[in-house]
Interface confidence: low
């Protein structure tokens, strides 16, 4: 079955700057600002557009080793980024894949809202643990906060 999970996270960073850093340059920036979570992101095929495959290696102390993601859509004009987790111990034995649709929208006061809509594709009739879905959201939030902190400390970058 398919289990949906939606989350919204407020950010003080304007949408365009956040998309440019967190999404478009995330492969380089995230391991730099959150080394305690992600140790490396390696592009193993593609130019960053749809079809690109990335290997993400988690840091020591994180209960997962690696994840393989496929880029499904990149919409620079509307700050949309869709990708699918297709491999990795994060999926366990009950999940076939997890598809994420990320959209960053402008918010009052100059900030933005990061909206994530996730579809957890379970194998057969397996249920998806709510904790697993919540855990994915919390990890994404940690990475977002780290990127925000970096952007505030380095005001000249990603403008």
């Amino acid at each position: 079955g398919v289990f949906n999970y939606e989350a919204e996270t407020p950010s003080v960073i304007p949408a365009a700057r956040l998309f440019k850093s967190y999404v478009l340059d995330g492969d380089k920036l995230i391991p730099k600002v959150a080394p305690q979570v992600i140790s490396s992101v390696e592009n193993v095929g593609g130019n960053g557009g749809p079809g690109t495959i990335k290997n993400i290696t988690f840091a020591e102390g994180i209960p997962f080793k690696f994840v393989k993601e496929r880029v499904d859509e990149v919409d620079n004009a509307n700050f949309k980024y869709n990708y699918t987790v297709i491999e990795g111990d994060v999926l366990g034995d009950k999940l076939e894949k997890v598809s994420h649709e990320l959209k960053i929208v402008a918010a009052p006061g100059g900030g933005s809202i990061v909206k994530i809509s996730s579809k957890f594709h379970a194998k057969g009739y397996h249920e998806v643990n709510a904790e697993k879905m919540k855990g994915a959201k919390e990890m994404a939030e940690k990475l977002l906060r780290a990127v925000e902190s970096y952007l505030l400390a380095h005001t000249a970058e990603y403008n």
């Epitope: 006061g109 906060r145 505030l152 400390a153």
Partner: antibody, heavy 125, light 112 residues
């Protein structure tokens, strides 16, 4: 693991000085404002001071102005609090905390989200 | 300085039952960006404080969803939908709109 570890506390006579240190691990403290918060024995929490990422902006509670100085060494991932002219009412556990506050942006605030275990300062003759 | 006032001072609770703590500020904590700069912290016995809620209603990472924050302006509330034994400790509200940041006096939550 993201953590903060304080040190430098101890027993000091009134009028004396101490330098408290706070070392961050698991994250780059240079990306964050940092705060000191204290708690007198059996009392509530009192925010003491905070410092901007690059050290250019510092804030203090009125009762410590002119006696306490906050500073940081980003290369060492460390935060400091120099406390001079100590008084009995400065006796407390001193906590450092990661402070996601930024007065310059106005909007950026996500709470004091990581705290150390605290270091105890006792002022007594 | 902004003065924060919490009530009650002490709150005896029964596990499984709801609980509510109020916090009032001496001036509005509503920023022009529409966010209320009000946090809730829990200090468990013998431990450092931990962040529960920031900007009035946003749960911090890892905080169980039985905790919720609400309110705007000068009146704020922390609710625990079903109290668990591990929730005992002292709860503090804190304003972060202006320095000096200021805390409420605390509410001690204990099991009946």
């Amino acid at each position: 693991e993201v953590q903060l570890v304080e040190s430098g506390g101890g027993l000091v006579q009134p009028g004396g000085s101490l330098r408290l240190s706070c070392t961050a691990s698991g994250f780059m403290s240079s990306m964050y404002w940092m705060s000191w918060v204290r708690q007198a024995p059996g009392k509530g929490l009192e925010w003491v001071s905070n410092i901007k990422q690059d050290g250019t902006e510092k804030n203090y509670v009125e009762s410590v102005k002119g006696r306490f100085t906050i500073s940081r060494d980003n290369a060492k991932n460390s935060l400091y609090l120099q406390i001079n002219s100590l008084r009995g009412e400065d006796t407390a556990v001193y906590y450092c905390a990661r402070d996601l506050y930024s007065s310059s942006s106005g909007y950026y605030y996500y709470g004091l989200d990581v705290w150390g275990q605290g270091t105890t300062v006792t002022v007594s003759s | 300085d902004i003065v924060m006032t919490q009530s009650p001072l002490s709150l005896p609770v029964t596990p499984g039952e709801p609980a509510s703590i109020s916090c009032r500020s001496s001036q509005s904590l509503l920023h022009s960006n529409k966010y209320n700069y009000l946090d809730w912290y829990l200090q468990k016995p013998g431990q450092s404080p931990q962040l529960l809620i920031y900007l009035s209603s946003n749960r911090a990472s890892g905080v169980p969803d039985r905790f919720s924050g609400s309110g705007s302006g000068t009146e704020f509330t922390l609710k625990i939908s079903r109290v668990e034994a591990e929730d005992v400790g002292i709860y503090y509200c804190m304003q972060a709109l202006h320095t000096p940041l200021t805390f409420g006096g605390g509410t001690k939550v204990e099991i009946k």
